[in-house]
Amino acid sequence: MAVTACQGLGFVVSLIGIAGIIAATCMDQWSTQDLYNNPVTAVFNYQGLWRSCVRESSGFTECRGYFTLLGLPAMLQAVRALMIVGIVLGAIGLLVSIFALKCIRIGSMEDSAKANMTLTSGIMFIVSGLCAIAGVSVFANMLVTNFWMSTANMYTGMGGMVQTVQTRYTFGAALFVGWVAGGLTLIGGVMMCIACRGLAPEETNYKAVSYHASGHSVAYKPGGFKASTGFGSNTKNKKIYDGGARTEDEVQSYPSKHDYV
């Protein structure tokens, strides 16, 4: 029950996180004009990963896309890439985790398969969250660097435009959304990994079946490293999930034709 709850909660938390990463990536307010010296402004600038916008006090807002790829700073391209990788990994992780959910029955899927899928999705969520956090942090670092550049023709780090009047930019709402979303995805991924441990069968206990041989009394327990025979000792203690599987170097005993069940 606790495993199902952990897995379910991990899925929900990751889902919220990935939705947040998508929202942050699409948002225009990654950087906003610094209003510290002038809290009342007639023209307010803000920028996203894909376009820059200007909002006038008249209420008129104009947004312009960055219609160049080569002209954009490498850092911005890197942030875009990190966010997209985060979204793609997260989306795949969500897809995998849906099938891995304990509460959802799909054919005769083994618990071991669900455990593997849960682990896979968990790792994907962790990497997705880390990508988002890294992307947002790289952008934030870029802003901090540009903020303290006091030259009049400061390179904005956005559209490659030269500014005649220095407009300083500070952290926008998208950064905080990205950090929180990345964190949630990361937490969700960790929860999935924890749930995976509970899903994976530690051992397979089968009911012992007694075989009465004419010469010896043997309790034969197929599979598992706890199985032992009266003929020798199992020194390997290998863990076997499939009751029928055997390793070549294991000491095995087979009932003779005279034995009966």
Epitope: Q33, N38, V40, T41, A42, V43, N45, Y46, Q47, S52, C53, V54, E56, S57, S58, G59, F60, E62, R64, T156, M161, Q163, T164, V165, T167
Partner: antibody
Framework: QVQLQQPGPELVMPGASVKLSCKAS????????MHWVKQRPGQGLEWIGE????????NYNQNFRGRSTLTVDKSSSTAYMQLSSLTSGDSAVYYC???????????WGQGTSVTVSS | DIVMTQSPSSLTVTAGEKVTVGCKSS????????????LTWYQQKPGQPPKLLIY???TRESGVPDRFTGSGSGTDFTLTIRSVQAEDLAVYYC?????????FGSGTKLEIK
């Protein structure tokens, strides 16, 4: 079409106060900020302040802060400007104007002439 | 506050002539975000309220004759009237729309001979 109606001239005593009105029509009143501009006889234009009718947010020119108060009545689509402690220097034509694209004053009222005299 | 300086304060021209009115701002009116200059030109005829002519330094308001053109960037701006007509008798004002408080130039009075 957009219209800003302002009343006729006002004659007031020094030290008194006056409340000027500006009735808007032809557009959604709450969608555009209303600005007030002062023009003394034979002089240039001086920006007094603005009010956002949607939330009554105001922004004043430092020279007018304290002596002028901007308000709106959404139900009647009317903007008001109250001027207090009037002096002869306040004798002027006061215009209301609607803010538009490019932070321009695209539509103006006819103006209300205020004369401060004893 | 941004100070707007207009020149000349007045000028007298003959109908059909080309007129240029200058406007200088104490700070740049160019916004880096959209590369637009927040400089507006108004025309005020005697006994009337001002009328919007040009915004964003060079964008003509609808209904304004094409003989009126605005140019300039940063701190220096010009209003040009290609072929002055008798009805252009007015005072022309430039206005800063880039930062509060909005400020106007002192005006240029255009008179026709």
């Amino acid at each position: 079409q957009v219209q800003l109606q302002q009343p006729g001239p006002e004659l007031v005593m020094p030290g008194a106060s006056v409340k000027l009105s500006c009735k808007a029509s032809g557009y959604t009143f709450t969608s555009y900020r209303m600005h007030w501009v002062k023009q003394r006889p034979g002089q240039g234009l001086e920006w007094i302040g603005e009010i956002d009718p949607s939330n009554s947010y105001t922004n004043y020119n430092q020279n007018f802060r304290g002596r002028s108060t901007l308000t709106v009545d959404k139900s009647s689509s009317t903007a008001y400007m109250q001027l207090s402690s009037l002096t002869s220097g306040d004798s002027a034509v006061y215009y209301c104007a609607r803010l538009g694209r490019g932070n321009t004053l695209g539509y103006w009222g006819q103006g209300t002439s205020v004369t401060v005299s004893s | 506050d941004i100070v707007m300086t207009q020149s000349p304060s007045s000028l007298t021209v003959t109908a059909g002539e080309k007129v240029t009115v200058g406007c200088k701002s104490s700070q740049s009116l160019l916004n880096s975000g959209n590369q637009k200059n927040y400089l507006t030109w108004y025309q005020q005829k005697p006994g009337q309220p001002p009328k919007l002519l040009i915004y964003w330094a060079s964008t003509r308001e609808s209904g304004v004759p094409d003989r009126f053109t605005g140019s300039g960037s940063g701190t220096d701006f010009t209003l040009t009237i290609r072929s002055v007509q008798a009805e252009d008798l007015a005072v022309y004002y430039c206005q800063n729309g880039y930062s509060y408080p909005f400020t106007f130039g002192s005006g240029t009075k255009l008179e026709i001979k």
